[in-house]
């Protein structure tokens, strides 16, 4: 009988996956080495796939390898001592200045350099930097950018305000329609700040005296409404208003006389005059009554060569006149002329002249008050500073408003450095159709007086008081206010402007950069203003804007009986 | 397997001076960081000192109340981290445990050696 | 530095009853680590980086929280689930150890 060679040789199992090999009859047992599996031990086990140990118990990778496995980290992780779990690397504790000036925050298997909002990590420096958001194109009209954020203006002289989203710009609309029909038979007499509205040169027989008949009507209480002179400049008359009343300067080679007289006529309403030289004095008629009768010795302008050459300027006088009247006199007056008959010649030549110029027509009716038509603004040059008072400068204001575009500056100082150390502005508020009144130093907003309905046919009462310690709301409204301690951090800023020089603005500000406060759009609307107890007059502003109208507010465009005409009660002026 | 054996502890005089060593086995123990934890009844766990591997330049770091006192030290060759103890106080006292540091935190802790300090 | 103050101290569990254990930190932290210590034994890593468990460690306990406050739950209490258990941070060069919750069974 042969003998059964040794199964185990050659070799039948898996060099690599066997442990041992053992002899049978006619067969062989391959012992397998861990991690291997079959017959002769030729199959790897992958543990990674083992269902009773998920994953090889590797918290992250699992790494088969033949007859074995290993665990792995990923990146940004590191293995703890079982070699099987994976801990994420706090980048931020081992590196402590890995961000520089940034702050760093650890993220699972990788770290972060965060700065704050409105700046950007900047990996060549490691720092934060200021974003500039404004070369991103964020707002539409005008960009500012400060460190860490930016903010968006849009141009109030244009009639811009920003919208709710903070970014684009939207026109400031028409919040109270108001009524500015004009007339060209209506001569208006305050086309001019400073200047003649018209002027006139007649050469007539010398037959001829001085007449002027008109119908005129104001609320101003002061202003010429003619000057007339000769054409050597030695005789002239002046008709003017004082204290609402008619008042005639002449003065001639014979005489120098000065007359007021007659009732009241700065009362809105169409008051017949007429000025007329007789043989030996010079008769004021209004509504046909006489009211002045001035003597003279002789004729008023002494003709030359035949002829009577006069001179007649409407609502002003040649400068040089100024040194030379009998009693000085404000000549900006606010008021209409219609049907004037000058020197018995009738209207001819000056309609057709007036029916060319828009801005010499008189609208058609007027309401007391000052009227600014979002286009300029007034300066006037007051001292707050109250010697007999301990708290040093205090400024007192009444604002009577009827405003008729939601948005505007109403009030502002302004110091030399074109920094805004106090406004009250107009804002439109977040709830429809009703505005904020905002009072603001710089360009932080220090009181907000929230949703009034202001555009409305009755005018709208505001009181306040400030000195270098308060700010004080007399009108008893609900308001939003800083905290105190920022409130006085901002009354000082104001008090520091206040020890030098401001110029007060009413109606908008002058040029200053858009960022120098919360609100740049004109005021448009009625306002009349009163402050430290004097009511202002703006026919005594140190610089007016042409379109500003002194002593007349158009009226509102029609009466409609909804609830938008009803205003805050609390608001209603009760003088 | 990680195994890490601390030694030295012992019965040491307030002032007095004391040196700790411990063992490390079963990792590559010149890349690991090694500290030292002490724990007592009175104060619970409380980090002593760290000292970090050759990549970072074997830097040392202490707990405040230990500072200027104990000197933590390693030896890549032999596989061994020391805490040099001087100017012992009574409020040292307590079971001194080696750890393998990583990534911020105690990830195998040796048996402990037992130090107490008093008169 | 930065103290762990961890709530309650002592504390005893019905088996299957859920436990939960505070660790209110002085100032944000981004991670908590958790020990468990048994009598006459080394502190053990049990749970790291506020979640995550330790291989090995059953998956009746968790970890969670953020910024100053970290907790570990144990869905059901078992016997041997009883020991003081230890949360730990690191920040600015200095590591911190809660005072322990000594967790018993009843």
């Known amino acids: 009988v042969n003998a059964i060679p040794d199964q185990c040789s050659p070799l039948p199992c898996n060099e690599d996956g066997y442990m041992s090999c053992k002899d049978g009859k006619a067969s062989f047992t391959c012992t397998c080495k861990p991690g291997w599996q079959g017959e002769k031990c030729e199959f790897d086990i992958n543990e990674c796939k083992d269902p009773s140990n998920i994953n090889g118990g590797c918290s992250q990778i699992c790494d088969n390898t033949p007859g074995s496995y290993h665990c792995s980290c990923k990146s940004g992780f590191v293995m703890l001592s079982n070699k099987k779990d994976c801990k994420d690397v706090d980048e931020c504790s081992l590196k402590p200045n890995m961000c520089g000036t940034a702050v760093c925050k650890n993220i699972p298997g990788d770290f972060e350099c965060e700065c704050p909002e409105g700046y950007r990590y900047n990996l060549k420096s490691k720092s934060c930097e200021d974003v500039d958001e404004c070369s991103e194109n964020m707002c539409a009209q005008l960009c500012v950018n400060y460190p860490g954020g930016y903010t968006c203006y849009c141009d109030g002289k244009k009639g811009f305000k920003l919208a709710q989203d903070q970014k684009s710009c939207e026109a400031v609309s028409v919040c109270l329609p108001l009524n500015l029909d004009t007339k060209y038979e209506l001569l208006y007499l305050a086309e001019q700040f400073a200047g003649v509205v018209l002027y006139l040169k007649f050469r007539l027989p010398e037959i001829s005296r001085f007449s002027a008949e008109f119908d005129f009507r104001t609320y101003d209480s002061q202003g010429v409404i003619l000057y007339a002179e000769s054409i050597d400049h030695s005789a002239w008359l002046l008709i003017a208003l004082r204290g609402g009343k008619i008042e005639v300067q002449l003065k001639n080679e014979h005489t120098s006389k000065i007359t007021t007289g007659g009732d009241i006529i700065n009362n809105g309403l169409w008051n017949m005059v007429s000025v007329e030289e007789l043989e030996h004095s010079i008769s004021i008629k209004i509504a046909k009554e006489a009211v002045m009768d001035i003597n003279k010795p002789g004729p008023l302008f002494k003709p030359e060569n035949g002829l009577l050459e006069t001179k007649v300027y409407f609502a002003g006088f040649p400068r040089k006149v100024e040194s030379e009247l009998i009693k000085p006199i404000n000549p900006r007056l606010d008021g209409c002329i219609r049907s004037w008959n000058l020197m018995k010649q009738g209207a001819s030549g000056i309609k057709e002249i007036i029916q060319e110029k828009q801005n010499k027509h008189c609208l058609v009716t007027v309401e007391k008050g000052s009227y600014y038509p979002g286009s300029g603004i007034a300066e006037f040059h007051i001292d707050y500073n109250n010697g007999s008072n301990a708290e040093g400068w205090h400024i007192n204001v009444t604002l009577n408003i009827r405003p008729s575009m939601g948005t505007g500056v109403m009030l502002a100082l302004v110091s030399s450095n074109n920094t805004v150390p106090f406004a009250v502005s107009l804002v439109d508020s977040t709830s429809e159709k009703s505005q904020d009144i905002v009072i603001s130093v710089e360009n932080t907003v220090i009181y907000r007086i929230q949703a009034l309905s202001l555009c409305s046919n009755q005018r709208s009462h505001l009181e306040f008081r400030v000195n270098r310690n308060n700010l004080e709301l007399l009108t008893p409204l609900k308001i939003e206010t800083i905290s105190q301690e920022e409130l006085q951090t901002q009354l000082a800023i104001l008090d520091k402007a206040m020890k030098g020089k401001v110029a007060t603005y009413l109606g908008g500000l002058p040029d200053v950069p858009f960022s120098a406060t919360p609100v740049n759009a004109f005021y448009n609307g009625c306002m009349e203003v009163n402050i430290n107890g004097v009511e202002l007059d703006l026919d005594e502003a140190i610089s007016k804007h042409n379109d500003i109208r002194a002593h007349s507010c158009p009226s509102v465009w029609k009466k409609t009986k909804n609830s938008e005409d009803q205003v805050d009660p609390r608001l209603i002026d009760g003088k | 397997e990680v195994k890490l054996e601390e030694s030295g502890g012992g019965l040491v005089q307030p002032g007095g001076s004391m040196k700790l060593s411990c063992a490390a086995s079963?990792?590559?123990?010149?890349?690991?960081?090694m500290d030292w934890v002490r724990q007592s009844p009175e104060k619970g766990l409380e980090w002593v000192a760290e000292?970090?591997?050759?990549?970072?330049?074997?830097?040392?770091y202490y707990a405040e109340s230990v500072k200027g006192r104990f000197t933590i030290s390693r030896d890549d060759s032999k596989s061994g981290v020391y805490l040099q103890m001087n100017s012992l106080r009574p409020e040292d006292t307590g079971i001194y445990y080696c750890?393998?540091?990583?990534?911020?935190?105690?990830?195998?802790w040796g048996q402990g050696t037992t130090l107490t300090v008093s008169s | 530095q930065i103290a762990l103050t961890q709530s309650p101290a002592i504390m005893s569990a019905s088996p299957g009853e859920k436990v939960t254990m505070t660790c209110s930190v002085s100032?944000?932290?981004?991670?908590m680590h958790w020990y468990q210590q048994k009598p006459g034994s080394s502190p053990r890593l049990w749970i790291y980086?506020?979640?995550n468990l330790v291989s090995g460690v059953p998956g009746r306990f968790s970890g969670s929280g953020s910024g100053t406050s970290y907790s570990l739950t144990l869905s059901s209490m078992e016997a041997e689930d009883a020991a003081t258990y230890y949360c730990?941070?690191?920040?600015?060069?200095?590591?911190?150890f809660g005072g322990g919750t000594k967790l018993e069974i009843k």
């Open positions: 750890t393998l540091t990583t990534a911020f935190l105690f990830d195998y």
């Open positions: 079963g990792f590559t123990f010149s890349d690991a960081w």
């Open positions: 000292i970090r591997s050759k990549a970072n330049n074997h830097a040392t």
């Open positions: 100032s944000s932290v981004s991670y």
């Open positions: 980086d506020t979640s």
């Open positions: 730990q941070q690191y920040s600015g060069y200095l590591y911190t």
